[in-house]
C-alpha cells in the first residue's frame, strides 16, 4: 500500500481467483483513544471500532472510503483504491491501446518545435467517474523540472457503437535547452482513477523523436507565363523554432489529381518555392520534416490547381 | 577550416557534408525507432558518447560568440563515432554487406573531421569505451543504438554547419 | 558450385590431438564464416565454434575448454578444426559448414550454415 | 547456455497427414521482439543437415508444405502433408547466444 495523495492510498493486488489479498492497517488522524468507530462509503454498518482497522482488501467491494467517527462527528478519511496486477502484469483498463507507432502505446505526445513544450493525449471509452493527474521529468534517476497543467477532455468520438473520448495535456520542460543534443529521456506519468480502481502509465522519450512540425504556412500559387507550370511558395509555420538558418525544415510538394487513383507527382526541397506542372481539377499540397532529423513529417497544406 | 587557433572551418563544405551524414546516417537504420531495443540483460550502453550539450556553445548565441568551443565539440564526436564505426561492434558479426550505408558513413565522419581538423593540429578527443560484446546479438543492439545516437549528433553538427554557412561565412 | 571437401577419416589414441581440414571453393573464402558441428554415432548434433575470416573472430563452445582450435588460411581457402586430449566421447563425424552471418536494413539478423562437408569421422580408442 | 528441448523425440505420421515438431528453449531466442534467431535443419540418413527454415522464412527450394512459427521460447515447425521424402531428423538450433545449441532432434517416420 502507498499514498498517492493526502488521505488517498493504492492497494497493489495479484489479481487471480481466490488471491489472498493484500492486509492493511488503517489508523484514524485524530489525537482521540477511545469510542472511535468505523464505516465504508455511504453505509452505517460498524466495521469495528478503535484507533486502528485492520482489513483484508481482496476485490472491489473492500475498496472505497473509509472513515473513522467519534460520536457522529466525522474524525478522518482514507480513500482506498485497488491496483491490479494480473500474471504479472499492471492492469490497462482505464486507457485505449492506440497501437501506433507499437501495440501497447497508451499515451501519444507531440511537439511542434524544440522549445521544449509538448502535448500529449490519450484515449478511454470511459465517460463518468474518472480523473487523471499528469507528472513530468527529464531524466529519472535525477529528474529535471517539467510542468505539466490539468487533462483536459479534448475531443469526443463515436467509434462503431460506442463514444471515444480523448483527454489531452500540455506540459513545458523548465528549462529547455532547444540547441543541445537530449541525452536523456523525457518521462511522462499519467496516474488514472476510474471509481476505485487506479492504473499509471508512463511513455518515454525524446522530444527529437515526437516533433512534428505544423503545415506550411502562407501556400500560394503564382502562374508562369505561356507555361502550364506554376511557381508555388510558402513560409515556415509560425510555430516552428527560429532561426530558421539553424532550425530549417526540409519540404515535400505534392501535385493530386481529383481521383485519388491518379499518380501523384513529388518534389523534395529544401527551398520554400518550387516550380509544379499544375493539371486541370488537380490539388498542390506541401508538408515539412525537420531537413536533419526524421521525425514526423507536418500535415498538408493544400491549395487547388485552378 | 577550424584549427585550434581560431580561423573559420570551411562552413559551406560542413554544412554539406554534415547534411549527407544525416542522410547515411538515417539510410543505416530507417527501422531503428521501431524495434523493441528492451532486451534482457540491456544496459544502458550508449551512456559514454558525447553529447552536444547546453553549454558547449552550439546554439546560435554560442557560434556568434565563439564557434571554437562548439566545434572542438562536434570534431571531439566525430572522432568517437568514426572509431566506434570501424570498431568490432561494426566490424564483426552479423557482418554488414559490403554496400551498406555504415562503410560512407564511416568514411564521411571521418571526412568531415578533417574538414574541421588539418593534420598537425590537435584538439584532444574523448576516450572510447571499450565496447566489445560477448555476444552477436548485443553487437548487433549497440549498432543500434549507437546509430540511434549519431543521428541526433549529426542533427545538431548540421544545425551548426548550416548556420554558419548562411551567418558567418566571410 | 560451392564445396566444401574434408580431409579424411583418423583413428587417433586417447590423449592425442586431431586436426580437421576444411577446403573451401566456389565463392570468397573470406565473405563467409566456417563452423564446426559435430555428431556421436546415433546423436544429435553439437555445435563446437565458427571462425570468421574477414573479421578475425573466433566463436567457442565453452563447454570443449580450451581443447578446441579454429582457424583459417585465406592464401589457400582451407579451415582447421584441432581437437587435443581427445577422449573416447569424442568419436564423432566432425562436419564444416559455411556460415553466411549478416544484418542489414531489413533483416537485422541472418544466419545460415548453407553448405556443409561430407563429414569426417574421427575415431578415438586405445 | 540456452537448453533447446525438442518434442516429441519420434512422430510416425500417415504419408499426407500433418506433422508438428516443437522446440522449446530456456530463454527468449526472439530479437528486438520480433526477429527470430531460431532455425530449423533436416538430416537424412548418411548426409549432413540441410537449413530448410531461417528465422521465420523457408530457404528457397523447401517445398511450401514446411511452415515455421513461434517466438520468444516456443517454436514449431509444421509438415502440412507429409511426403515419403521428408522422413529424416528434424533439429532446431539457436544463434542468439553464444555457444549455439541444436535441440535434441526429432525424427519423422511414416506410420
Known amino acids: 500500500i502507498w499514498e498517492l495523495k493526502k488521505d488517498v492510498y493504492v492497494v497493489e493486488l495479484d489479481w487471480y481467483p481466490d488471491a489472498p489479498g493484500e492486509m492493511v492497517v488503517l489508523t484514524c488522524d485524530t489525537p482521540e483513544e477511545d469510542g472511535i468507530t468505523w464505516t465504508l462509503d455511504q453505509s452505517s454498518e460498524v466495521l469495528g471500532s478503535g484507533k486502528t482497522l485492520t482489513i483484508q482488501v481482496k476485490e472491489f467491494g473492500d475498496a472505497g472510503q473509509y472513515t473513522c467517527h467519534k460520536g457522529g462527528e466525522v474524525l478522518s478519511h482514507s480513500l482506498l483504491l485497488l491496483h491490479k496486477k494480473e500474471d504479472g502484469i499492471w492492469s490497462t483498463d482505464i486507457l485505449k491501446d492506440q497501437k501506433e507507432p507499437k501495440n501497447k502505446t497508451f499515451l501519444r505526445c507531440e511537439a511542434k518545435n524544440y522549445s521544449g513544450r509538448f502535448t500529449c493525449w490519450w484515449l478511454t471509452t470511459i465517460s463518468t467517474d474518472l480523473t487523471f493527474s499528469v507528472k513530468s521529468s527529464r531524466g529519472s534517476s535525477d529528474p529535471q523540472g517539467v510542468t505539466c497543467g490539468a487533462a483536459t477532455l479534448s475531443a469526443e468520438r463515436v467509434r462503431g457503437d460506442n463514444k471515444e473520448y480523448e483527454y489531452s495535456v500540455e506540459c513545458q520542460e523548465d528549462s529547455a535547452c532547444p540547441a543541445a543534443e537530449e541525452s536523456l529521456p523525457i518521462e511522462v506519468m499519467v496516474d488514472a482513477v476510474h471509481k476505485l480502481k487506479y492504473e499509471n502509465y508512463t511513455s518515454s522519450f525524446f522530444i527529437r523523436d515526437i516533433i512534428k512540425p505544423d503545415p506550411p504556412k502562407n501556400l500560394q500559387l503564382k502562374p508562369l507565363k505561356n507555361s502550364r507550370q506554376v511557381e508555388v511558395s510558402w513560409e515556415y509555420p509560425d510555430t516552428w523554432s527560429t532561426p530558421h538558418s539553424y532550425f530549417s525544415l526540409t519540404f515535400c510538394v505534392q501535385v493530386q489529381g481529383k481521383s485519388k487513383r491518379e499518380k501523384k507527382d513529388r518534389v523534395f526541397t529544401d527551398k520554400t518555392s518550387a516550380t509544379v506542372i499544375c493539371r486541370k481539377n488537380a490539388s498542390i499540397s506541401v508538408r515539412a520534416q525537420d531537413r536533419y532529423y526524421s521525425s514526423s513529417w507536418s500535415e498538408w497544406a493544400s491549395v487547388p490547381c485552378s | 577550416r577550424a584549427v585550434p587557433g581560431g580561423s573559420s572551418p570551411a562552413w559551406t563544405q560542413c554544412q554539406q557534408l554534415s547534411q549527407k551524414l544525416c542522410t547515411l546516417a538515417w539510410s543505416a537504420h530507417p527501422l531503428v525507432g521501431h524495434m523493441d531495443l528492451r532486451e534482457e540483460g540491456d544496459e544502458e550502453t550508449t551512456n559514454d558518447v558525447p553529447h552536444i550539450q547546453c553549454g558547449d556553445g552550439c546554439d546560435p548565441q554560442g557560434l556568434r560568440d565563439n564557434s571554437q568551443f562548439c566545434l572542438q565539440r562536434i570534431h571531439q564526436g566525430l572522432i568517437f563515432y568514426e572509431k566506434l564505426l570501424g570498431s568490432d561492434i561494426f566490424t564483426g558479426e552479423p557482418s554488414l554487406l559490403p554496400d551498406s550505408p555504415v562503410g560512407q558513413l564511416h568514411a564521411s565522419l571521418l571526412g568531415l573531421s578533417q574538414l574541421l581538423q588539418p593534420e598537425g593540429h590537435h584538439w584532444e578527443t574523448q576516450q572510447i569505451p571499450s565496447l566489445s560484446p560477448s555476444q552477436p546479438w548485443q553487437r548487433l543492439l549497440l549498432r543500434f543504438k549507437i546509430l540511434r545516437s549519431l543521428q541526433a549528433f549529426v542533427a545538431v553538427a548540421a544545425r551548426v554547419f548550416a548556420h554558419g554557412a548562411a551567418t558567418l561565412s566571410p | 558450385q560451392v564445396q566444401l571437401v574434408q580431409s579424411g577419416a583418423e583413428v587417433k589414441k586417447p590423449g592425442s590431438s586431431v586436426k580437421v581440414s576444411c577446403k573451401a571453393s566456389?565463392?570468397?573464402?573470406?565473405?563467409?564464416?566456417i563452423t564446426w558441428v559435430r555428431q556421436a554415432p546415433g546423436q544429435g548434433l553439437e555445435w563446437m565454434g565458427e571462425?570468421?575470416?574477414?573479421?578475425?573472430?573466433?566463436y567457442y563452445n565453452e563447454k570443449f575448454k580450451g581443447r578446441v582450435t579454429i582457424t583459417a588460411d585465406k592464401s589457400t581457402s582451407t579451415a582447421y578444426m584441432e581437437l587435443s586430449s581427445l577422449r573416447s566421447e569424442d568419436t564423432a563425424v566432425y562436419y564444416c559448414?559455411?556460415?553466411?552471418?549478416?544484418?542489414?536494413?531489413?533483416?537485422?539478423?541472418?544466419?545460415?550454415?548453407?553448405?556443409w562437408g561430407q563429414g569426417t569421422l574421427v575415431t578415438v580408442s586405445s | 547456455d540456452i537448453v533447446m528441448t525438442q518434442s516429441p523425440d519420434s512422430l510416425a505420421v500417415s504419408l499426407g497427414e500433418r506433422a508438428t515438431i516443437n522446440c522449446k528453449a530456456s530463454?527468449?531466442?526472439?530479437?528486438?521482439?520480433?526477429?527470430?534467431?531460431l532455425h530449423w535443419y533436416q538430416q537424412k540418413p548418411g548426409q549432413p543437415p540441410k537449413l530448410i527454415y531461417n528465422?521465420?522464412k523457408p530457404e528457397s527450394g523447401v517445398p511450401d508444405r514446411f511452415s515455421g512459427s513461434g517466438s520468444g521460447t516456443d517454436f514449431t515447425l509444421t509438415i502440412s502433408s507429409l511426403q515419403a521424402e521428408d522422413v529424416a531428423v528434424y533439429y532446431c538450433?539457436?544463434?542468439?547466444?553464444?555457444?549455439?545449441?541444436f535441440g535434441g532432434g526429432t525424427k519423422v517416420e511414416i506410420k
Open positions: 530463454k527468449k531466442v526472439t530479437i528486438f521482439g520480433s526477429t527470430s534467431a
Open positions: 528465422g521465420a
Open positions: 538450433l539457436q544463434n542468439k547466444e553464444v555457444p549455439y545449441t
Open positions: 559448414a559455411r556460415a553466411e552471418f549478416i544484418s542489414t536494413v531489413v533483416a537485422p539478423y541472418y544466419y545460415a550454415l548453407d553448405y
Open positions: 571462425n570468421y575470416p574477414r573479421s578475425g573472430n573466433t
Open positions: 566456389g565463392y570468397t573464402f573470406a565473405s563467409y564464416g
